[in-house]
């Protein structure tokens, strides 16, 4: 294998630190140069790499969406950590957005788990103790106080 002279635009920008790859791989916080001879540092707050790699570029940092709070900023070795705001959660099967937590359980159910950034409130049937499917109840199903009945809120 032979290599032609590097084109001038391949040379690193001054602010990007360089080191040599180890067995063809660059450490976390770096990516490899086109010719495989140098490790180039990721740009703090812009991109990152978490593992030893031979990729031509670092991965772009995540930007927290509105409705999310930033728990920790992006570094050259770790992506931004975002979390849903209080009162909202993100499910594993729909990770693209934070959803509002339910304010109460359907009729005949009691709350056994609070709203967290990762899960909706958890409801179980009063008698059987089996979990509710997690579907948002229709408005008329939600437990509310009615005249002559003591309120038994789930939240």
């Amino acid at each position: 294998i032979t290599q032609q002279d590097l084109a001038p635009q391949q040379r690193a920008a001054p602010q990007q630190k360089r080191s040599s790859p180890s067995e063809g791989l660059c450490p976390p916080g770096h990516h490899i140069s086109e010719d495989g001879r140098d490790c180039i540092s990721c740009k703090y707050g812009q991109d990152y790499s978490t593992h030893w790699n031979d990729l031509l570029f670092c991965l772009r940092c995540t930007r927290c969406d509105s409705g999310e709070v930033e728990l920790s900023p992006c570094t050259t070795t770790r992506n931004t950590v975002c979390q849903c705001e209080e009162g909202t959660f993100r499910e594993e099967d729909s990770p693209e957005m934070c959803r509002k937590c339910r304010t109460g359980c359907p009729r005949g159910m009691v709350k056994v788990g609070d709203c967290t950034p990762w899960s909706d409130i958890e409801c179980v049937h009063k008698e059987s103790g089996t979990k509710h499917s997690g579907e948002v109840p229709a408005v008329e199903e939600t437990v509310t106080s009615s005249p002559g009945t003591p309120a038994s809120p789930c939240s």
């Epitope: 294998i1 032609q4 063809g24 140069s33 086109e34 031979d54 990729l55 031509l56 570029f57």
Partner: nanobody, 123 residues
Framework: EVQLLESGGGEVQPGGSLRLSCAAS????????MGWFRQAPGKEREFLAV????????YYAESVKGRFTISRDNAKNTVYLQMSSLRAEDTAVYYC????????????????WGQGTLVTVKP
């Protein structure tokens, strides 16, 4: 979705020339390399050359250095392989491929492949 379309293959006499083209679409990486490989019947796929998009770094296999030239047209997202002084042993299916790894001269470093174009060198 990444798509690679090779063209320019055909039959040519020994000592003749051909230019292969590979048009790429769906590439959204900050940088990548586009390489050429070939596979003759009953043989392993062989690396020929790669050119990188950002810096223009080029690698050649010794077997084709001086006879084959890789080039690119950034505006058309197309890479070319100019082949000259062709020999019977250059007969093979020629493949275009994309890598996001540095110094990529091994087949396993390539993630996307075209369907290939046949080059036949015979008198």
């Amino acid at each position: 979705e990444v798509q690679l379309l090779e063209s320019g293959g055909g039959e040519v006499q020994p000592g003749g020339s051909l230019r292969l083209s590979c048009a790429a679409s769906g590439l959204t990486f900050p940088n990548y390399g586009m390489g050429w490989f070939r596979q003759a019947p009953g043989k392993e796929r062989e690396f020929l050359a790669v050119i990188y998009w950002s810096g223009g770094t080029v690698y050649y296999a010794e077997s084709v250095k001086g006879r084959f030239t890789i080039s690119r047209d950034n505006a058309k997202n197309t890479v070319y392989l100019q082949m000259s002084s062709l020999r019977a042993e250059d007969t093979a299916v020629y493949y275009c491929a994309v890598t996001i790894r540095g110094a990529a001269t091994q087949t396993w470093k390539y993630d996307y492949w075209g369907q290939g174009t046949l080059v036949t060198v015979k008198p």
